[in-house]
Interface confidence: medium
């Protein structure tokens, strides 16, 4: 086509020179200057932004580093030049959050949109009498869904930042040391008491190691949504149920529904936000599996969803089974990747934390050496991984998981059957040809699924250049909910895997990630990396990035692209 656009019945004011013409000559630019058409300097026409658009709504967002808009309406803005805007206001009465599209050439609430070109919505305070008023604008799809009040790295001078860190670090060392000692002593005491109360799966390790490793596990505790750690990993056997008020339905799975809920604090008005997974009476087995997995205190890890308690509830709908866990406002990884393009740092963080979570699940010991029952997830996929506020992953949905108890016989393992989601099933699972003599083979199927998730993350990383809309693995090959047979055709017959375009490999960090995930989806389960090895590779990437002092450069990694890790 190219200049051929000028042919036909095109009205003069939408005549466009495309990329073949490289840039639009000034006289043509004037002729296309109506407000429905916006072009970049290469002559491409901008599609209007996708923005959250709920106008003004009451909000609970207060005193947080960032908030989700909780707006369920995504609109294509009317005009291509419009950007996404969020306005947060607080007065004596209430807090509101406004989400709209707006033209940055025009003031909004009497303020100019100074940050319209930013891909993130970073709130800036504006002076308004009688209220606290914050506003942000941004220009990437649905960027006003996640509003940020404090950007972690907001200094433009990294050297200055380093100096600040060094000075404050040195001056804070003595009081920090004292504080950490006090915390460790307190935790050891608390955990010691908890240890006496709970009967955990133990082997003959010394008490000393148990005490040391327990405080170690607690130091690793995640940045929980806002849950007091005191009630973590308990089963609520009491007849008195927790004071929970269900809020909104946030997810629906095969076996259960997940609600955002308020956990009331004593008699005060205060509450903590939690997630409640509600299983109907018929899905008791699934609830019990997940409850039993969560009950193991050694499962506790920053990259595994934090569990509070399990309850049996009688309602007018009959008996229900509840699991109460931490709530993560960013939602699951699939939703997050659908809404957001991620940076190289985000990819490294998400990938690394995912691998660490799976490695911990698979491990037969805690990070501090305490014995632990290895577990396989068996349904790893992007919708079963939650994104925490610090942009790390945590695993959830253990309804199909299996504890690799050394007492299980081959028959027991064989009876566990072909489980999981067809799209993410490893070739040997699709074929029902697993080596049941070796429990490691179960872990290898998790690693295959993890590789597909790492590919999903990479496909949405802007370090690769072209970022397409989110697609699940094999998105263009199979329908939305593929059956085992169609996956067999793709994965077994055609030996198909998601495509890794050559331009992804221009970024050396991404190249390493691609090499890693390719080794993880190998047809031969024995040839796949372990989750621990993948975690180590991500650590090495982080180390290499830190050495280079730059975050996005393609020169960060040694030319030979070597990473010294073993399987």
């Amino acid at each position: 086509m190219g200049r051929g656009l000028l042919r036909g019945l095109w009205p003069l004011h939408i005549v466009l020179w495309t990329r073949i013409a490289s840039t639009i000559p000034p006289h043509v630019q004037k002729s296309v200057n109506n407000d429905m058409i916006v072009t970049d300097n290469n002559g491409a026409v901008k599609f209007p932004q996708l923005c959250k658009f709920c106008d003004v709504r009451f909000s609970t967002c207060d005193n947080q580093k960032s908030c989700m808009s909780n707006c369920s309406i995504t609109s294509i803005c009317e005009k291509p030049q419009e950007v996404c805007v969020a306005v947060w206001r607080k007065n004596d009465e209430n807090i509101t959050l406004e989400t709209v599209c707006h033209d940055p050439k025009l003031p909004y609430h009497d303020f100019i949109l100074e940050d319209a070109a930013s891909p993130k919505c970073i709130m800036k305070e504006k002076k308004k009498p009688g209220e606290t008023f914050f506003m942000c604008s941004c220009s990437s799809d649905e960027c006003n869904d996640n509003i940020i009040f404090s950007e972690e790295y907001n200094t433009s001078n990294p050297d200055l930042l380093l100096v600040i860190f060094q000075v404050t670090g040195i001056s804070l060392l003595p009081p920090l040391g004292v504080a950490i000692s006090v915390i460790i002593i307190f935790y050891c005491y608390r955990v010691n008491r908890q240890q006496k109360l709970s009967s955990t799966w133990e082997t003959g390790k010394t008490r000393k190691l148990m005490e040391f490793s327990e405080h170690c596990a607690i130091i690793l505790e995640d940045d929980r949504s806002d849950i007091s750690s005191t009630c973590a990993n308990n089963i609520n056997h009491n007849t008195e149920l927790l004071p929970i008020e269900l809020d909104t339905l946030v997810g629906k799975g095969r076996f259960a529904e997940v609600y955002k809920a308020k956990l009331k604090q004593n008699t005060s008005e205060q509450f903590e936000t939690v997630a409640v997974k509600i299983f109907p009476y018929e899905e008791y087995a699934s609830w019990k599996t997940e409850k039993d997995i969560f009950s193991d205190i050694n499962l506790k890890h920053e990259n595994i969803l934090q569990f509070l308690t399990a309850e049996e509830r009688k309602t007018e709908l009959g008996k229900q089974y509840w699991l109460i866990t931490a709530f993560h406002a960013k939602g699951n990884l699939q939703e997050y990747l659908t809404r957001h393009v991620i940076s190289w740092e985000d990819l490294r963080k998400l990938g690394s934390s995912l691998a660490r979570g799976i490695a911990h699940l698979h491990s037969d010991h805690t990070p501090c050496g305490r014995p632990k029952m290895p577990i396989v997830h068996r349904d790893l996929k992007s919708s079963n991984i939650l994104v925490k506020n610090d942009l790390t992953c945590c695993l959830c949905d253990f309804g199909l998981s299996l504890r690799l108890d050394p007492t299980l016989s081959v028959d027991d393992l064989a009876n566990s059957g072909q489980v999981g989601t067809a799209r993410y099933m490893a070739p040997e699972v699709l074929e029902s040809r697993m080596n049941l003599e070796n429990v490691e083979s179960f872990k290898q199927t998790d690693v295959y699924s993890m590789a597909l998730v790492l590919w999903e993350m990479t496909s949405r990383c802007n370090a690769v250049g072209e970022v397409k809309d989110y697609e699940p693995p094999f998105g263009s090959k199979v329908r939305e909910h593929p059956c085992v047979e169609s996956m067999k055709d793709n994965v077994l017959r055609d030996r198909g895997r998601p495509e890794i375009p050559s331009f992804w490999l221009n970024h050396q960090g991404i190249q390493m990630v691609c090499e890693t995930l390719t080794e993880c989806w190998d047809h031969d389960p024995e040839a796949r990396l372990t989750a621990q090895c993948v975690a180590e590779r991500f650590s090495e990437l982080e180390h290499l990035d830190r050495l280079s002092g730059r975050s996005c450069s393609e020169e960060k990694i040694p030319e030979d692209g070597s990473l010294n890790t073993t399987k």
Epitope: M1, T18, R19, D40, N42, G43, A44, V45, K46, F47, Q49, L50, P119, S139, S140, D141, T338, V341, N462, G465, E466, V467, K468, D469, Y470, E471, P472, G475, S476, E480
Partner: nanobody, 121 residues
Framework: EVQLLESGGGLVQPGGSLRLSCAAS????????MAWARQAPGKGLEWVSR????????YYADSVKGRFTISRDNSKNTLYLQMNSLRAEDTAVYYC??????????????WGQGTLVTVSS
């Protein structure tokens, strides 16, 4: 050479249906997001809908939500727009467009010549 050729337009009564097609050639169709836009007589260009490269994600303008459905057949290199419950205000020239890439923003660099849809009793 990139080519986009729309077809399927015509005269239809209010409440009626039409299916527009856009045949693409000159590029790897399955690699690119596609979109439909329209221009009513004497008005500016209005975006109608957008679809991801494999058809997994779709987006619609509020004015057509629930009535129009965008789809694609990558094996036939064809983009579709199924238009139901048509109204007089849907009268316009409908264009199909191919997305280019800049990492974050959605920009469309190639356009068809358009097909005219007239909704009138």
């Amino acid at each position: 050479e990139v080519q986009l050729l729309e077809s399927g337009g015509g005269l239809v009564q209010p409440g009626g249906s039409l299916r527009l097609s856009c045949a693409a050639s000159g590029f790897t169709f399955s690699d690119y997001d596609m979109a439909w836009a329209r221009q009513a007589p004497g008005k500016g260009l209005e975006w109608v809908s957008r679809i991801s490269h494999s058809g997994y994600s779709t987006y619609y303008a509020d004015s057509v939500k629930g009535r129009f459905t965008i789809s694609r057949d990558n094996s036939k290199n064809t983009l579709y727009l199924q238009m139901n419950s048509l109204r007089a205000e849907d009268t316009a020239v409908y264009y199909c467009a191919k997305r280019s890439w800049d990492g974050v923003h959605a920009q469309f660099d190639y356009w068809g010549q358009g097909t005219l849809v007239t909704v009138s009793s």
